[in-house]
C-alpha cells in the first residue's frame, strides 16, 4: 500500500486546513475490515495522541486540544481519508499521522504531515 501526503503543510493562523491523505491498494475498500487512525504529535519524539478513527464508521475522539474543530472530509471508498482542521492555531503545530489498514492488504500504510502555522501571509516571491 502506498500513502500520499504532503511532507509539510504551511497554514495561515486562523484559517482552515485540509490535511490530505490518500492511498492506493490492490484491493477495494471493504468497510467492515478497513481501519484508519489519525494521530497528532507535538514533536518528532513526542508520544502520539489519536484524534480520529474509522472502524466501520468515523469515530471522532474529541481530543481536548482540537475541541470540535476536526472533521473527516475523505471517502475511503475513493481511497481518500483526508481530514479538515478548522481555525488552525499555533498550538496545532506538529506532526499529523494517518495510518491505514485495508485487508486483505497486509501492509499498513502510513503518511506523516508536518504542519507549520504561519502568523502572517508569506511575502510573494518575485517572479522576475
Amino acid at each position: 500500500m502506498e500513502v500520499t501526503v504532503p511532507a509539510t503543510l504551511n497554514v495561515l493562523n486562523g484559517s482552515d486546513a485540509r490535511l490530505p491523505c490518500t492511498f492506493n491498494s490492490c484491493y477495494t475498500v471493504n468497510h467492515k475490515q478497513f481501519s484508519l487512525n489519525w494521530t497528532y504529535q507535538e514533536c518528532n519524539n513526542c508520544s502520539e495522541e489519536m484524534f480520529l478513527q474509522f472502524r466501520m464508521k468515523i469515530i471522532n475522539l474529541k481530543l481536548e486540544r482540537f475541541q470540535d474543530r476536526v472533521e473527516f472530509s475523505g471517502n475511503p471508498s475513493k481511497y481518500d481519508v483526508s481530514v479538515m482542521l478548522r481555525n488552525v492555531q499555533p498550538e496545532d503545530e506538529g506532526i499529523y499521522n494517518c495510518y491505514i489498514m485495508n485487508p486483505p492488504d497486509r501492509h499498513r500504510g502510513h503518511g506523516k504531515i508536518h504542519l507549520q502555522v504561519l502568523m502572517e501571509e508569506p511575502p510573494e516571491r518575485d517572479s522576475t
Partner: nanobody, 116 residues
Framework: EVQLVESGGGLVQAGGSLRLSCVTS????????MNWFRQAPGKEREFVAR???????YYAESVKERFIISRDNAKNTVYLQMNSLKPEDTANYYC??????????RGQGTLVTVSS
Amino acid sequence: EVQLVESGGGLVQAGGSLRLSCVTSGRTSDLSTMNWFRQAPGKEREFVARITRRGSTYYAESVKERFIISRDNAKNTVYLQMNSLKPEDTANYYCTAASEMGYHYRGQGTLVTVSS
C-alpha cells in the same frame, strides 16, 4: 537532531519579572521559528510567543505588552523576558523549534510560579 534546554523559571511575586532562556544545540542551522508555549496543570498547552529567523515576533494577546521574546544567534539562545507577572501566568514554560524541513522539537520546560 536538535536539543532544547530551558532555564530561568522560579517563584516570583505578582508584578515581578523573570527572564527565561532556551539554549539550542545540535543541528540548529536550519531552525526557522522558535516558540515559547506554556502549560498549566490540567490545561492544554497555550502559545505564548514566536520569533522567526528574520526576527519577526508574535505574541498571544494575554501576554502582549508584558512579555518580550528575543534571540541571540551567536549563543543559540532564545529569551523570554516576562514582566508584570500575574498568578494566571503560573505554568510550565517550554520552547519549541521548527526546522525548514518541517521537523518539530521541544524542550522539557521550566516551571514559573507567580504568587499573589
